[in-house]
């Protein structure tokens, strides 16, 4: 439906409020070095050129796109070319083609310092004092910080954080209510972004059919008692929704999310009963429990598939007909039988599934072909489910922090190329799916475990695609999105790499060691590790396992000692000294 | 031919309990849905409880409460742990697995008499 204005339409549709905070997100995640004031100050002058655009719809530019008008106030930013180099020729082009200048530009690891917190009492009257300002803020340092955050999800996680420090700056202890929170935002929160980073890849790298397939596997594991018409209608709005969140359009995303939401509380019965409390909900926290909501309970009376998929002598005829509808619902019927299974597994399946149809339809006897295809199956499931095993067995015999040290050795010497904060980055979240999982009943493991890897490794492929190093790494993550982690388990150590010359400098550590949080210790010692294994790569379990220890009680003696910077420097050497003697 | 073996079946008096195995003879992967169903004399064969390979369990109106349906994956057994019998719960039972790619399999039944 057209609307004379557009600007205008969404001003309405969204309310003023959620209008302002998501033109802030869109500012902020495009031009991420500018300063907050500037963004305010756009954000208000579109805020105010809407209203004019809302009581007359005729009135001058009022008619523009929203890509036109939001382009056109990005570009008036005077320190363009200083502060985004390249991107000011953006502002050359004319839309739609400026737009997607714009998004190719969106850092995905930008230069920012990290965000520290203040002391509660200074936060706490930073928000009385003018409490929308600083909600404010918080989406633009999120937003920032993460160019594909889901732009109407932050909104919501604006108004938790708003919650929070209503609740906790009235505490009688305003640290003990307020710092688990907003440890809990936090965690949430990156996890969420990583989450939609993955959904914006597989957009933009690999195509809708790709988005689809996956959105068809997930639904429909999720509400397994709805018609195959019914998941496919969500899966067609839901890509909509998306595709325009990843395209920067977030006034129509959120929009239409909000459209989406309210379409499935009207529709309950014919999707899922575990909607219900989500639906009594407001809009932002409705959307989040949608997307969020349960499995349902999967019908008692599903047939085995092999009739409709292998036996029946219509096979091709069907697929030939309507292949993508065919595969969908193969995928459908799959994944609804399958809450135990990841959805990369089921894409895998079904890929599997195409790839023998495209082969035996174009057979002889094609019934003879197939006819034995779900035996190409067994092994597709078994494997992810053996590597559950295996890791969740090493994850409880470890724990986290040796099991990342696991991780980082194994992963670096998979692909010692790639750039040692990247390498810790990576290595340490891939350690943490053992406590994200391994807790969990064997039927919720895979989905789980894999599920999560897969947003991981998309961080891992994120970055390597900025400054790509390894030709390895390239491989597992273009050719296809649903084997990227099994491309990626399958890697070994990388024979051709030319181990890196020792640096002493590397492996030099001072006073302000034992001054450094616990999480920040494990990552300095963590960085050592890489560093190690790219210096020796063939070196055993054994031999990095006593380098590390002597590391920690190398550090922990001379963190004890009085002159802690003498003790660094005096045992310093010495133990540069004793790892290169044990590696040698 | 994979096979399912039910075992803990017995005499047992009114208020007591039993607990009923199902072992397959094999792993079978591509299982999507597992059950006890019980024929009690001169009845036909009744669902009893199920458990989803998502976890989700679903009773029969008459043993919700008394009866809990699990499984243990790695030893690949089905469980029925069955408290406050009563003399109308007596029966054969059979455990049934049904699979995505494959037909459903049943095993031979095991007996549950209680006595009042």
């Known amino acids: 439906d057209t609307h004379k204005s557009e600007v205008a339409h969404r001003f309405k549709d969204l309310g003023e409020e959620h209008f302002k905070g998501l033109v802030l997100v869109a500012f902020s995640q495009y031009l991420q070095q500018c300063p907050f004031e500037e963004h305010v100050k756009l954000v208000n002058e579109v805020t105010e050129f809407a209203k004019t655009c809302v009581a007359d719809e005729s009135a001058e530019n009022c008619d523009k796109s929203l890509h036109t008008l939001f382009g056109d106030k990005l570009c008036t930013v005077a320190t363009l070319r200083e502060t985004y180099g390249e991107m000011a020729d953006c502002c050359a082009k004319q839309e739609p083609e400026r737009n997607e200048c714009f998004l190719q530009h969106k850092d995905d690891n930008p230069n920012l310092p990290p965000l520290v917190r203040p002391e509660v009492d200074v936060m706490c009257t930073a928000f009385h004092d003018n409490e929308a300002t600083f909600l404010k803020k918080y989406l633009y340092e999120v937003a920032r910080r993460h160019p594909y955050f889901y732009a109407p999800e932050l909104l919501f996680f604006a108004a938790r954080y708003k919650a929070a420090f209503a609740e906790c700056c009235q505490a009688a202890d305003k640290a003990a209510c307020l710092l688990p929170k907003l440890d809990e935002l936090r965690d949430e929160g990156k996890a969420s972004s990583a989450k939609q980073r993955l959904k914006c890849a597989s957009l933009q790298k690999f195509g809708d059919r790709a988005f689809k397939a996956w959105a068809v596997a997930r639904l429909s594991q999720k509400f397994p008692k709805a018609e195959f018409a019914e998941v496919s209608k969500l899966v067609t709005d839901l890509t909509k929704v998306h595709t325009e969140c990843c395209h920067g359009d977030l006034l129509e995303c959120a929009d239409d999310r909000a459209d989406l939401a309210k379409y499935m509380c009207e529709n309950q019965d014919s999707i899922s009963s575990k909607l219900k409390e989500c639906c009594d909900k407001p809009l932002l926290e409705k959307s989040h429990c949608l997307a969020e909501v349960e499995n349902d309970e999967m019908p008692a009376d599903l047939p085995s598939l092999a009739a409709d998929y292998v036996e029946s002598k219509d096979v091709c005829k069907n697929y030939a007909e309507a292949k993508d509808v065919f595969l969908g619902m193969f995928l459908y019927e799959y994944a609804r039988r399958h809450p135990d299974y990841s959805v990369m597994l089921l894409l895998r399946l079904a890929k599997a599934y195409e790839a023998t149809l495209e082969k035996c339809c174009a057979a002889a006897d094609p019934h003879e072909c197939y006819a034995k295809v779900f035996d190409e199956f067994q092994p597709l499931v078994e494997e992810p489910q053996n590597l559950v095993k295996q890791n969740c067995e090493l994850f409880e015999q470890l724990g986290e922090y040796k099991f990342q040290n696991a991780l980082l050795v194994r992963y670096t010497k998979k692909v010692p190329q790639v750039s040692t904060p990247t390498l810790v980055e990576v290595s340490r979240n891939l350690g943490k799916v053992g406590a994200k999982c391994c807790k969990l009943p064997e039927a919720k493991r895979m989905p789980c475990a894999e599920d999560y890897l897969s947003v991981v490794l998309n961080r891992l492929c994120v970055l390597h695609e900025k400054t790509p190093v390894s030709e390895k790494v390239t491989k597992c993550c273009t050719e296809s999105l649903v084997n990227r982690r099994p491309c990626f388990s399958a890697l070994e150590l990388d024979e051709a790499y030319v181990p890196k010359a020792f640096n002493a400098e590397t492996f030099t550590f001072h006073a302000d060691m034992c001054t450094l949080s616990e999480k920040e210790k494990q990552v300095k010692k963590q960085t050592a590790l890489v560093e190690l294994v790219k210096h020796k790569p063939k070196a055993t379990k054994e031999q990095l396992k006593g380098v590390m220890d002597n590391f920690a009680a190398f550090v922990e003696k001379c963190c004890k000692a009085d002159d802690k910077e003498a003790c660094f420097a005096e045992e310093g050497p010495k133990f540069v000294a004793a790892s290169q003697a044990a590696l040698a | 031919e994979v096979q399912l073996v039910e075992s803990g079946g017995g005499l047992v008096q009114e208020g007591g309990s039993l607990r009923l195995a199902c072992a397959a003879s094999e792993r079978i992967w591509d299982i999507n849905l597992l059950g006890w169903y019980r024929q009690g004399p001169g009845n036909e064969r009744e669902l009893v409880a199920t458990?989803?390979?998502?976890?989700?369990?679903s009773y029969a109106d008459s043993v919700k409460g008394r009866f809990t349906i699990s499984r243990d994956y790695d030893k690949n057994t089905l469980y029925l742990q069955m408290n406050s019998l009563r003399p109308e719960d007596t029966g054969l039972y059979y455990c049934k697995i049904r699979r995505t790619w494959h037909s459903e399999l049943w095993g031979q039944g095991t007996q549950v008499t209680v006595s009042s």
């Open positions: 458990i989803t390979v998502g976890d989700s369990t």
